[in-house]
């Protein structure tokens, strides 16, 4: 009965690790009792409470210490008005910060100057991310758009790489995968006359 | 002026019921968000439980859930703590607290708290 | 069922500068608020939302927070500062709130 949700939808872009205090305003009612929703679900953070601002007219606020990735997404206020359910706007959080890992390389054992391929990919937002290649403390390549795939022809000792991932909010460095020889049976066929380095950089859709 | 007036000193026997009250005055607005905090003697603060809204929902701490009820009554702006059967632990001063955020002027909240003056509870047989 | 950490006291000498802290590993994500009571007293809230001071509480408390630790700074302790300290915050699931078991602050 002229209850009203105000304010029109948002979206509210924060930085990783940073406060973020989402408002509500409620008229029409007097003592709301106002519920966050977070994608569906009620928010439970008891030190929350509301203002009054006139006998029929309340903001609710919804405070957040410091937003990491689980926080992003769709928020709303509702309030029980009479048996129905009235809901707000919604917020639409973003939360931006470094590069975030979906795929590390691994730890591989390979047979000496074998080739084999390892994998990065990582995302924001902000997007685009790069990837830089590292073997050791030596930059092999990049940069260029994540996921990557790093193609090495071969190694002839045990040998470290990792990726590491640039957005505009920063770097992550992945983890470090080392790359063990696996020992070749005497006898092998196995060629030992090459004792160099071979890698290859490339965005899996140019892969041959 | 704000007060939150709680009821007086009480002596139980264990198994016994209680009642203990908390009544609110100098408010604008009946917004009802009360807590309750126990204190045994000597030792430290213990939340036990909260009031919000007028449709008086209520959380529990872990340790007094299902030993305590809160509750309020909003045309007499009086929240309780009520128990069926009393222990000789439940022993202590039990606090009622009212949270209270306003604004001046702008609207970024102030936070405010007022405590009650405390009710002694004794539990011996 | 969550817990905040605090150590059980704290001495400083008048006009030195008392810190205490509480742990909990809801911390990084909740926020801390700080109690003040002195013997036969009901308590005072002194600091909310980590670092917010009430009104009419001296400059000297000023309250921080920096991972799984919050801590309250009184900066030239005073006698009349001596009192039980209490941290209190939300827990990890933000269903129930706790306070920590109290330091005692000596100011000698």
């Known amino acids: 009965a002229g209850l009203k949700l105000m304010g029109a939808p948002v979206k509210l872009t924060v930085s990783q690790g940073q406060p973020v205090k989402l408002n509500c305003s409620v008229e029409g009612m007097e003592e709301p009792d106002i519920q966050w929703v977070k994608d569906g679900a009620v928010v439970q953070n008891l030190d929350q409470l509301y203002i009054p601002v006139s006998e029929q007219h309340w903001i609710g606020f919804l405070s957040l210490k410091s937003v990491e990735r689980s926080d992003a997404g769709r928020y709303w206020c509702q309030v029980e008005d009479g048996g129905e359910t009235e809901i707000s706007q919604p917020v639409w959080l973003t939360v931006e910060g470094v590069p975030f890992f979906t795929v590390e390389p691994k730890d591989l054992a390979v047979p000496p100057n074998a080739p084999f391929q390892l994998s990065c990919e990582a995302v924001g937002p902000p997007e685009p991310v790069t990837i830089v290649w590292w073997r050791g403390t030596t930059k092999i390549g990049g940069p260029a758009p994540s996921p990557s795939v790093l193609n090495v022809t071969g190694v002839t000792q045990s040998t470290m790489f990792s990726c590491e991932a640039h957005n505009l909010k920063g770097l992550a460095s992945s983890r470090t995968a080392t790359v063990h020889l696996q020992l070749v049976p005497r006898g092998s066929s196995a060629h030992h006359h090459h004792h160099h380095h071979h890698s290859a950089w490339s965005h899996p859709q140019f892969e041959k | 002026e704000v007060q939150l007036v709680q009821s007086g000193a009480d002596v139980k026997k264990p198994g016994a019921s209680l009642t203990i009250s908390c009544q609110a005055s100098?408010?604008?607005?009946?917004?009802?968000?009360i807590s309750w905090v126990r204190q045994k003697p000597g030792k430290g603060l213990e939340w036990m439980g909260q009031?919000?809204?007028?449709?008086?929902?209520?959380h529990y701490g872990p340790s007094f859930q299902g030993h305590v009820t809160i509750s309020a009554d909003r045309s007499t702006a009086t929240a309780y703590l009520q128990w069926r059967s009393l222990e000789a632990s439940d022993t202590a001063m039990y606090y009622c607290?009212?949270?209270?955020?306003?604004?001046?002027?702008?609207?970024?909240?102030?936070?405010?708290?007022?405590w009650g003056p405390g009710t002694l509870v004794t539990v011996s047989s | 069922s969550y817990e905040l950490t605090q150590p059980p006291s704290v001495s400083v000498s008048p006009g030195q500068t008392a810190r205490i802290t509480c742990s909990g590993d809801?911390?990084?994500?909740?926020?801390a608020y700080w109690y003040q009571q002195k013997s036969g007293q009901a308590p005072v809230l002194v600091i909310y939302?980590?670092?917010k001071r009430i009104s009419g509480i001296p400059e000297r408390f000023s309250g921080s927070s920096s991972g799984t630790m919050a801590t309250l700074t009184i900066s030239g302790a005073q006698v009349e500062d001596e009192a039980d300290y209490y941290c209190?915050?939300?827990?990890?699931?933000?269903?129930?709130?706790?306070f920590g078991g109290g330091t005692k602050l000596t100011v000698l």
């Open positions: 607290v009212r949270h209270q955020q306003q604004t001046s002027g702008g609207t970024i909240p102030e936070y405010y708290q007022h």
């Open positions: 100098g408010y604008t607005f009946t917004d009802y968000w």
């Open positions: 009031i919000r809204g007028p449709a008086s929902a209520t």
């Open positions: 809801a911390l990084p994500k909740k926020y």
């Open positions: 939302e980590d670092k």
């Open positions: 209190y915050s939300t827990s990890t699931g933000g269903n129930y709130m706790v």
